[in-house]
């Protein structure tokens, strides 16, 4: 038998975020129902996080052996504390998009452990705030955005824009 | 290390340009709001101009607004003020210093550049 | 514009002491979204400022717990329970709540008696 160690070391978790009790579960992606120690964990979830503070899991299985896989869950800050906003100026909107993740509330988290993605089309850009320009009047466009913390997906966000009519003449 | 580094500040006549840099380096420079504050020479602290993460948005107080331009290239990690129409009330200690957002908090301040305006 | 007055201008502590700052602002510094963005920052000779309090009352990251932030509204205090060496310096409030008019407090120097 592998030690739950080598067995779990690559494992990855998915943070699901409640609005109402404004805790999270970690989901830890594994095919077998694991034992996590201390922690309790039901159906290979680990509920009531608290944001930006990190939980230790040990996670353990019938089908691995002693040192078990010491996980550091380390979760993310509050969804509601980030906000897809519509920055595109009234004067430029028949042919520009202009999108921004605003951070309504501060919160503990280290702000360098986190990164934003955009993706609108073929185009995927790396940046909190995005500005598309020399776009086609009347057209609808699609962007989808997601926010990381330490690589991991804690939210994300789509917008669909129409552009303005062109002026006349043009 | 997050780091702040400005640089070009120098002595010009009134009326004269000048543009100073901030070199970040550290940290993902393209997720944080950037802003220049200045101090002058009686030690009052003020705020100058503002630039949003990608560059976006721009915010000055009336006393430069139309001689200063903030702007920021995202590729180089770089920040810059661009002064013109300098006048001896612009003499200061110019720092850049970074704001997650506009409604956090200036967190790391670079060690600052002196300009000063005198004929 | 918000102007913000400090007061006093200099401020005279024996290390050890209390010391308290005030900060008040022309207008309600109190954002529509319910918070008050009131920052302190603490500059010490030749150096660049550095960030205390934020929010009125929230202590940055390696900030000493006997620094302190309190008020509301318009009036905000800094109290430094037991003043150390490593205190001495120029303290400004900030206040930003009228985005993006951000403006500074004239500060306050704080001096060994």
């Known amino acids: 038998k592998p030690t739950c160690d080598e067995k779990y070391a690559n494992i990855t978790v998915d943070y699901l975020y409640n609005k109402e009790t404004k805790l999270f579960t970690a989901k830890l992606n594994v095919n077998e129902t694991v034992e996590c120690g201390n922690n309790t964990c039901t159906n290979n979830e680990v509920h009531n996080l608290t944001e930006c503070k990190n939980a230790s899991v040990s996670i353990s299985h019938n089908s691995c052996t002693a040192p078990d896989k010491t996980l550091i869950l380390d979760v993310p800050p509050g969804v509601e504390k980030f906000q897809l906003h519509d920055c595109t100026q009234v004067e430029k909107a028949d042919t520009t998009i202009c999108l921004k993740w605003k951070n309504i509330e501060t919160f503990t988290c280290d702000t360098q452990n986190i990164t934003y993605r955009f993706q609108c089309g073929n185009m995927i850009f790396d940046n909190k705030e995005i500005k598309l320009e020399n776009l086609e009047p009347e057209h609808e466009y699609k962007c989808d955005s997601e926010i990381l913390y330490n690589n991991h997906k804690f939210t994300n966000a789509s917008k669909i824009i129409k552009t303005d009519f062109g002026s006349p003449g043009e | 290390e997050v780091q702040l580094v400005e640089s070009g500040g120098d002595l010009v006549k009134p009326g004269g340009s000048l543009k100073l840099s901030c070199a970040a380096s550290?940290?993902?420079?393209?997720?944080?709001?950037m802003s220049w504050v200045r101090q002058t020479p009686e030690k009052r602290l003020e705020w100058v101009a503002y630039?949003?993460?990608?560059?976006?948005?721009?915010y000055y107080p009336d006393t430069v607004k139309g001689r200063f331009t903030i702007s920021r290239d995202n590729a180089k990690n770089t920040l810059y003020l661009q002064m013109s129409s300098l006048k001896s009330e612009d003499t200061a200690m110019y720092y850049c210093?970074?704001?997650?957002?506009?409604?956090?908090?200036?967190?790391?301040w670079g060690a600052g550049t002196t300009v000063t305006v005198s004929s | 514009d918000v102007l913000m007055t400090q007061t006093p201008l200099s401020l005279p502590v024996s290390l050890g002491d209390q010391a308290s700052i005030s900060c008040r602002s022309s207008?309600?510094?109190?954002?529509?979204?319910?918070?008050?963005?009131l920052e302190w920052y603490l500059q010490k000779p030749g150096q660049s400022p550095k960030l205390l309090i934020y929010?009125?009352?929230n202590r940055f990251s390696g900030v000493p717990d006997r620094f302190s932030g309190s008020g509301s509204g318009t009036d905000f205090t800094l109290k430094i329970s037991r003043v150390e060496a490593e205190d001495l310096g120029v303290y400004y409030c900030?206040?930003?709540?009228?985005?993006?008019?951000?403006?500074f407090g004239g500060g306050t120097k704080l001096e060994i008696k």
């Open positions: 900030f206040q930003g709540s009228h985005v993006p008019m951000y403006t």
């Open positions: 210093a970074r704001r997650y957002d506009v409604w956090w908090y200036f967190d790391v």
């Open positions: 207008q309600s510094i109190v954002h529509s979204n319910g918070n008050t963005y």
């Open positions: 630039i949003s993460s990608g560059g976006v948005s721009t």
């Open positions: 929010k009125v009352s």
């Open positions: 550290g940290f993902a420079f393209s997720n944080y709001d």
